[in-house]
């Protein structure tokens, strides 16, 4: 697994280098997570033909995966920094149960899956420091998450493969939208 941002030897070996700003650190963290997702997607696609699944088939699911919408204020039209930041943090918190599900779903990329999960927790902390209106952020109910996790793990193998593929695809799209929005802040 790649070394998380801020932990590579170059940072230690170059004390004269300017420390990263909060925004740069967040940007780097998201890009690091996206690299991890790419590696996981590669294993998923090599293992089965899930990656050829049609958008229609993937749309027929009952997963409530976070998705950016116009009202969230993260798109160029109608951009709203505070609303968007709340959406990004809330969405990442909602993704956490799905990232927990991904653990044990990978044979050769177990460490990578763990790295994506842990790096997302760090990203949430970075963003919470940036947010002014923390009260507007709703945390998912742990009991609901626990029963969702149990339900996902009870699915047959094909459904679990499809679910894994969809989570990775949706998380990638959510992070890419977040990255674009955060660069406007």
């Amino acid at each position: 697994a790649p070394v998380p941002p801020g932990e590579d030897s170059k940072d230690v070996a170059a004390p004269h280098r300017q420390p990263l700003t909060s925004s740069e650190r967040i940007d780097k963290q998201i890009r690091y997570i996206l690299d991890g997702i790419s590696a996981l997607r590669k294993e998923t696609c090599n293992k089965s033909n899930m990656c050829e699944s049609s958008k229609e088939a993937l749309a027929e699911n009952n997963l409530n995966l976070p998705k950016m919408a116009e009202k969230d204020g993260c798109f160029q039209s109608g951009f709203n920094e505070e609303t968007c930041l709340v959406k990004i943090i809330t969405g990442l918190l909602e993704f956490e149960v799905y990232l927990e599900y991904l653990q044990n779903r990978f044979e050769s990329s177990e460490e990578q899956a763990r790295a994506v999960q842990m790096s997302t927790k760090v990203l949430i902390q970075f963003l919470q420091k940036k947010a002014k209106n923390l009260d507007a952020i709703t945390t998912p109910d742990p009991t609901t998450n626990a029963s969702l996790l149990t339900k996902l793990q009870a699915q047959n193998q094909w459904l679990q493969d499809m679910t894994t593929h969809l989570i990775l695809r949706s998380f990638k799209e959510f992070l890419q939208s977040s990255l674009r929005a955060l660069r406007q802040m």
Epitope: S53, E56, A57, L58, E60, N61, N62, E107, K151, A154, Q155, N156, Q157, W158, L159, M162
Partner: antibody, heavy 119, light 111 residues
Framework: EVQLQQSGPELVKPGASVKMSCKAS????????MHWVKQKPGQGLEWIGY????????KYNEKFKGKATLTSDKSSSTAYMELSSLTSEDSAVYYC????????????WGQGTSVTVSS | DIVLTQSPASLAVSLGQRATISCRAS??????????MNWFQQKPGQPPKLLIY???NQGSGVPARFSGSGSGTDFSLNIHPMEEDDSAMYFC?????????FGGGTKLEIK
Amino acid sequence: EVQLQQSGPELVKPGASVKMSCKASGYTFTSYVMHWVKQKPGQGLEWIGYINPYNDGTKYNEKFKGKATLTSDKSSSTAYMELSSLTSEDSAVYYCAREGYGNLERDCWGQGTSVTVSS
Amino acid sequence: DIVLTQSPASLAVSLGQRATISCRASESVDGFGISFMNWFQQKPGQPPKLLIYVASNQGSGVPARFSGSGSGTDFSLNIHPMEEDDSAMYFCQQSKEVPWTFGGGTKLEIK
């Protein structure tokens, strides 16, 4: 052709244990989950649990925890189920069944192993 | 657990006529466009024979007179025309998730 060949009938005494086998052929054994199902004479079907031969991960019906133990042997492409502390309630036919994969592969069942518990 | 309610419990149909067996699930057995409902036929002393998988696909060697339909929570097995050899027990089963669950069975006889 996918085939599951189960071991022969067993007549066992109460309190004893029994271990039955399910030999798979015609597919990659480690790529599919193997389930076990119980059917008492003249009754319906009841899921016991499954084993994933790739990593030996198991999942059991709460009712059969402590009663059934699922194992597998990759080298011989064989799944096993051991039943312990047998009583007359365990007299039944036990089936192994390979899980399908989406609409591409159908489930496939063995012919069953009959277990009779009697003193 | 997903509960499957099968009806009727028994059914007598004349040769050449249509037999319809229903199976209702307590929650949807669909996922990503596939309905994980299977139908089995069982004769005394024999293992269950897979007739229909994923709601409407025929098992290998299954005659065309057996057909399955439905999605979500409501499914049915149709046999038409009814033949002598079709007298047996029929079960529905969901394989969407564990525990696998089964309907109570329908005893189909010749009228």
